[in-house]
Structures are given as structure tokens and as C-alpha cells.
């Protein structure tokens, strides 16, 4: 998160970590308890490591009581997620267990209404991605507001020229932004998961190259079947 | 499929307006920027300017302000460009394009002469 | 605004030969987002321009692969390597990283 802040912990009890060999890769968000949506791309990344998916945490290094590691038992990207591409960037990891609820621990609900966030709506975005260009990564959660921006002018020639379908949303990224290590997190408005954030290679923080949401609205009926 | 079809020709006397319309399908309308450019016989290209059919906001090159009023119908998917003034120098094909994959998808072209 | 020069005005040419048109700003036409938005587009007599490149050099989706377009900066090309009868026509180079966006005066393709 380029622009944040450190999160209040253990405040955005929906935040996971997705972990290969026991290091940060990707952001994801509890929508079930045994369920984990995060982003495709962020498989390709894990090769054959061990995936793991960490519950509960502020401080990815430090012991706390809330936080739990657990295995995944399956992994579902989404069949039309391609390499080349960031259509249909989304995957459920289904936990080995169902996740152990609590204050630190909780499902958030999602965005079922295909109806576009109205633009200039502030919306939170989480994650242990980058804070600096330097790449200089966190050990505790960062959150930014970001507001909503219209998709036509993330469509521009001189945004993202016209890459951004029905399917996507798009936030502002003046300096505020998520970055790379945020990917598979949440963008959240009004309490409800409204975004997956995409795992491009976009640059972050320039306001002309504006972050890219993958609108779980839009995909209710996959997230469904998978989670039946 | 992406279209932009346009309004007929226009005949118009000097000092008059008029109002030309392109109607979009194919793709949502409040998705992309739609912009106006200027074909005058056997020349060059001129940009007009562009509008955000979300909320209206318009960018005008500063030749074409005060001639060219750029406005949209979301109800319709129609974007419209009104030309008030005219004079014999307005007399040009004016083309719609749709911004976003540079500008791959225009209308056909409407001609508007302007003659007494 | 920015000029774009294109260069020559007229090209005349023999089907199967290599075409090349030079195009120049008058100032960079980098973005302040490091990338380069300079387009070809072709227009035939009757018709709206066609897109065939964009961002310098990428073709757009269609476009056959006798068309290239390189440079950067202030310096652009579009190369078609065998020339078709469908090939033809006006080409415009475009700047689209400065408002207001330019064209090129054109450059006609046609038959020696």
C-alpha cells in the first residue's frame, strides 16, 4: 500500500495473507468460513511452493494469539484466468479446516448487485504489499482510502486504454495505491467486499495509471458454485 | 459489435447552428470518453475535443471553444455536437470516435456544408 | 499544440515495394506517464480512419504484420514492408499525449 497507513489491528478481521514457503505473497479476504478470495495470477507466482493461508494477523512476524496458518486443501482460480491477461483475475482457496471464528477472525459479506460503485465513493484497500517504490515491505497491515473512479476515464488512452471491462472497477492511484504484494486483497466500500485487487505489473502511485479491481459482483454465480 | 452511426448530411446557411448526433452500440456508453474531430475537404484531421458520458465533463481544443458544444443523452447512448456560428470555414465532415484502444471504433461521418 | 510533420506528402509506389512515411513532432510526445502515444491511422477515399498502430509501435488487433511503426521521442515511422492495392490511401500520424491532440497533415500512398 503506497500512501497509507498502518491499519488498526486486527480491525479488518476479513484480512488474510496468502503464504508461499512461509512468506508473504498475496493479499486475500475471508468471504466464507473455509473460503479465501484472492487473485489468479498470484498462483503463478507460488511455482510448486506450499501455499498457506494466514487467519488473524497484524504482524506477519509477531506471535499473536489470533493467528492461525492453515493448509490449503484446494485451489480454484477462476477457468476463464489466463497468464497474459487480468480478466477474470480471481481464486478460492479452500481452507483444510474451517477457519476458527472470532473478533480477529471473520467472514465479510459480498457484493452480490451488479450495480457499479458510484464514482468518488471512498473505499478501503488493505494489504502487506509495498509502501515505498524502494520496495520496502511491512510487517504490519497498511490500509488506504481510495476514491472510485469512473471507467471511462480509467479507460483513456493515457490510463489503461480501454482495457477495463464491465467486469472491473478502477480507484484512484495519486500517490495513494495498492502495489505489488497487495494483490488478491480487498477493496471495500461501505462494509461490503466490492473488489479483488488485480496482480498486473502496474506501476503504482501514478495518477494516471489508476489500480484495477476485479468486481466480485460481477462473478456471484462462480463464487457461488464453487463455495456449494 | 461496436457501432457509431451518425446523423444524415446537413445543409445549413451562414450564421445558423446545428446539431449533429452519434448514436452508440455494442458496448455500455458510460464506459468510454467519445470524441469530435474535423475533416475539412481534402485536408488533415482536426481533434475538437471530448466528453465523459458519466458526468458530462468536457475538454475542448481551444480553436473549436465557443463553436463546438459537446453534450451526451446516456438514456439514448447518443452523443451530440452542436455548431453555432457557421460559416463557409465550418463546412468539413465531422466524425465521432470512441476513446479507449486509442481511437479504433468512428462514426461513418456526418457532412455539414454551410452555404447561403 | 504539438505539430506533427509528416513526411513525404506523397508516396508513389509499386505493389510488392517497402513504403516508409516519417512523421516528427515538434516537441516529445513522452506522457508525464512514460509512455509514448503516437498512432497511425489509415483513411481511405469515402471512409472514417482506421487504427492500424498505436503506443509507437503496437499493431492493433487485425492489422497485418507488412506494418511497422518505430521510433520515439520526436522521431516516428510507419513501415509497411510489401505493399497490397489494399494499403492505399491517406496515412495520419496522431500525438495523443497533449491536449489538444494532433494529426499530421498525411501522406498519400498511391500507385506510381
Known amino acids: 500500500i503506497l500512501g497509507g497507513r498502518e491499519a488498526e489491528a486486527h480491525a479488518r478481521p476479513y484480512m488474510a495473507s496468502v503464504q508461499v514457503n512461509g512468506e508473504h505473497l498475496c493479499g486475500g479476504v475471508l468471504v466464507a468460513e473455509q473460503w479465501v478470495l484472492s487473485a489468479a495470477h498470484c498462483l503463478e507466482d507460488a511455482a510448486d511452493g506450499k501455499v498457506q493461508v494466514l487467519l488473524g494477523a497484524h504482524s506477519l512476524s509477531q506471535p499473536e494469539p489470533s493467528k492461525r496458518l492453515y493448509d490449503v486443501l484446494r485451489a480454484v482460480p477462476h477457468p476463464d484466468s489466463r497468464p497474459d491477461t487480468i480478466d477474470h483475475d480471481l481464486l478460492l482457496l479452500q481452507l483444510s479446516e474451517k477457519a476458527t471464528l472470532g473478533p480477529a477472525v471473520r467472514p465479510l459479506p459480498w457484493q452480490r448487485v451488479d450495480r457499479d460503485v458510484e464514482p468518488g465513493t471512498l473505499c478501503d484497500v488493505a494489504g502487506w504489499g509495498i509502501v515505498s517504490h524502494a520496495g520496502r515491505r511491512p510487517d504490519r497491515l497498511q490500509h488506504v482510502l481510495l476514491p472510485v473512479l469512473d471507467r471511462a476515464t480509467c479507460n483513456r488512452r493515457t490510463h489503461h486504454d480501454g482495457a477495463i471491462t464491465q467486469r472491473m472497477m478502477c480507484a484512484e492511484s495519486n500517490r495513494r495505491d495498492s502495489c505489488k504484494g497487495d494483490s488478491g486483497g480487498p477493496l471495500v466500500c461501505g462494509g461490503v467486499l466490492e473488489g479483488v485487487v488485480t496482480s498486473g505489473s502496474r506501476v503504482c502511485g501514478n495518477r494516471k495509471k489508476p489500480g484495477i479491481y476485479t468486481r466480485v459482483a460481477s462473478y456471484a454465480a462462480w463464487i457461488d458454485s464453487v463455495l456449494a | 459489435e461496436v457501432q457509431l452511426q451518425q446523423s444524415g448530411p446537413e445543409l445549413v446557411k451562414p450564421g445558423a447552428s446545428v446539431k449533429i448526433s452519434c448514436k452508440a452500440s455494442?458496448?455500455?456508453?458510460?464506459?468510454?470518453?467519445m470524441n469530435w474531430v474535423k475533416q475539412s475537404h481534402g485536408k488533415s484531421l482536426e481533434w475538437i475535443g471530448d466528453i465523459n458520458p458519466n458526468n458530462g465533463g468536457t475538454s475542448y481544443n481551444q480553436k473549436f471553444k465557443g463553436k463546438a458544444t459537446l453534450t451526451v443523452d446516456k438514456s439514448s447512448s447518443t452523443a451530440y455536437m452542436e455548431l453555432r456560428s457557421l460559416t463557409s470555414g465550418d463546412s468539413a465532415v465531422y466524425y465521432c470516435?470512441?476513446?479507449?484502444?486509442?481511437?479504433?471504433?468512428w462514426g461513418q461521418g456526418t457532412l455539414v456544408t454551410v452555404s447561403a | 499544440d504539438v505539430l506533427m510533420t509528416q513526411t513525404p506528402l506523397s508516396l508513389p509506389v509499386s505493389l510488392g515495394d517497402q513504403a516508409s512515411i516519417s512523421c516528427r513532432s515538434s516537441?516529445?510526445?513522452?506522457?508525464?506517464?512514460?509512455?509514448?502515444?503516437l498512432e497511425w491511422y489509415l483513411q481511405k477515399p469515402g471512409q472514417s480512419p482506421k487504427l492500424l498502430i498505436y503506443?509507437?509501435?503496437n499493431r492493433f488487433s487485425g492489422v497485418p504484420d507488412r506494418f511497422s511503426g518505430s521510433g520515439s521521442g520526436t522521431d516516428f515511422t510507419l513501415k509497411i514492408s510489401r505493399v497490397e492495392a489494399e494499403d492505399l490511401g491517406v496515412y495520419y500520424c496522431f500525438q495523443g499525449s497533449h491536449v489538444p491532440l494532433t494529426f499530421g497533415a498525411g501522406t498519400k500512398l498511391e500507385l506510381k
Open positions: 516537441q516529445s510526445i513522452v506522457h508525464s506517464n512514460g509512455d509514448t502515444y
Open positions: 455494442g458496448y455500455t456508453f458510460t464506459d468510454h470518453y
Open positions: 503506443k509507437v509501435s
Open positions: 470516435t470512441r476513446e479507449g484502444a486509442s481511437f479504433a471504433f
